[in-house]
């Protein structure tokens, strides 16, 4: 008799999830010599232990604590790049500007990027059929709690000038309900962080508006100012040229506004 299985509203665990996490860990430790001491089997065991045999709507930050310990890493606190709804460009930027880090440039972020996972209460099985959706099912699911935990810790670690890349093509350039708006903004430490500098990325080639005047950016400025952190904002009118100029800053066309 087939066992009854909870049907959730979200997609199930990414196929070959254990193999993917393990392979990513091995690859990361090979690329980053300072992490070569990491035991990837222990990392996988800690990751698995955070959600296996637990109800996927009852996951806590504490469940991920063993994984956090194994992911200990040096991140220059003044070289942190946050992003919201514009992940690809943020990652392209840090691939060129190698001294800056997004969360996904760390081991823990790299392991989980774009993956979905969940288990089932009282069984050691991974659920490949469905996982809880944050809105339709529950917020304390394995994926959401993981990203909330590492995002909070990443923001807490930041200092001096923190940069955030925002998508100027969206109706809400700053969205209070995004991970950046709901977690990271509120966990920047005013005693360590002097300024939050927003980079608003324009989508249209002919878009010359000053999106730093957008009402949602003004809302972000208000939230940040109330936390005793200074705020600044820059328009990136030409993201393609922006990346090109990061690669080749000596280029004569890079002195003009981008």
């Amino acid at each position: 008799v087939p066992r009854w299985r909870q049907q959730w509203s979200g997609p199930g665990t990414t196929k070959r999830f254990p193999e993917t996490v393990l392979a990513r860990c091995v690859k990361y430790t090979e690329i980053h010599p300072e992490m070569r001491h990491v035991d990837c089997q222990s990392v996988w065991d800690a990751f698995k232990g955070a959600f296996i045999s637990k109800h996927p709507c009852n996951i806590t930050e504490e469940d991920y604590q063993p994984l956090m310990k194994l992911g200990t890493q040096t991140v220059p606190c003044n070289k942190i790049l946050l992003w919201s709804r514009i992940k690809d460009l943020a990652h392209q930027f840090t691939q060129v500007q190698r001294d800056m880090f997004t969360l996904e440039d760390t081991l823990l972020g790299y392991l989980a990027d774009d993956l979905t996972w969940c288990g089932e209460f009282n069984t050691s099985k991974i659920n490949y059929q469905s996982c809880p959706d944050w809105r339709k099912d529950c917020s304390n699911n394995p994926v959401s709690v993981f990203w909330k935990t590492v995002s909070r810790r990443f923001a807490e670690a930041a200092c001096d000038v923190v940069h955030v890349m925002l998508n100027g093509s969206r109706s809400k350039i700053f969205d209070k309900n995004s991970t950046f708006g709901s977690v990271e903004v509120h966990n920047l430490q005013p005693e360590k962080v002097q300024t939050l500098e927003a980079w608003v990325i324009h989508g249209g080639r002919e878009d010359s508006r000053d999106l730093c005047q957008d009402p949602t950016i003004k809302e972000l400025e208000s939230i940040i100012s109330k936390r005793n952190i200074q705020f600044s904002c820059k328009n990136i009118y030409r993201p393609d040229k922006f990346l090109q100029c990061v690669k080749n800053p000596e280029d004569s066309s890079c002195t003009s506004e981008i």
Epitope: M68, K69, L70, G71, T72, Q73, T74, V75, P76, C77, N78, T106, L108, V150, R153, F154, E156, A157, C159, Q189, E191, K192
Partner: nanobody
Amino acid sequence: EVQVLESGGGLVQPGGSLRLSCAASGFTFSNFAMSWVRQAPGKGLEWVSTISGGGGSTDYADSVKGRFTISRDNSKNTLYLQLNSLRAEDTAVYYCADGRGPFFDYRGQGTLVTVSS
């Protein structure tokens, strides 16, 4: 600006003890969890222990549990790590850092602990 200065390291025989100190400045010390991390020669960064801002909550790596004790004196802006029953594998540079990790940017020079007979 967050600044820390670690001290108290040295050469000690296996089974011996040391007390490390970390003097912190540039921030409201009691508002921040603080951690000890270490780096053994030729190895990566390893988290050792964390203590909450008020000192009421502590956590330890399995490898040091029962042997090391973290504490703090908020009136002196100082963090401590008592190292007992030291082993050769505890040989490392010990750093204190603000926060609970896993992302650390240690600001001090660290203090070297060498366990050898």
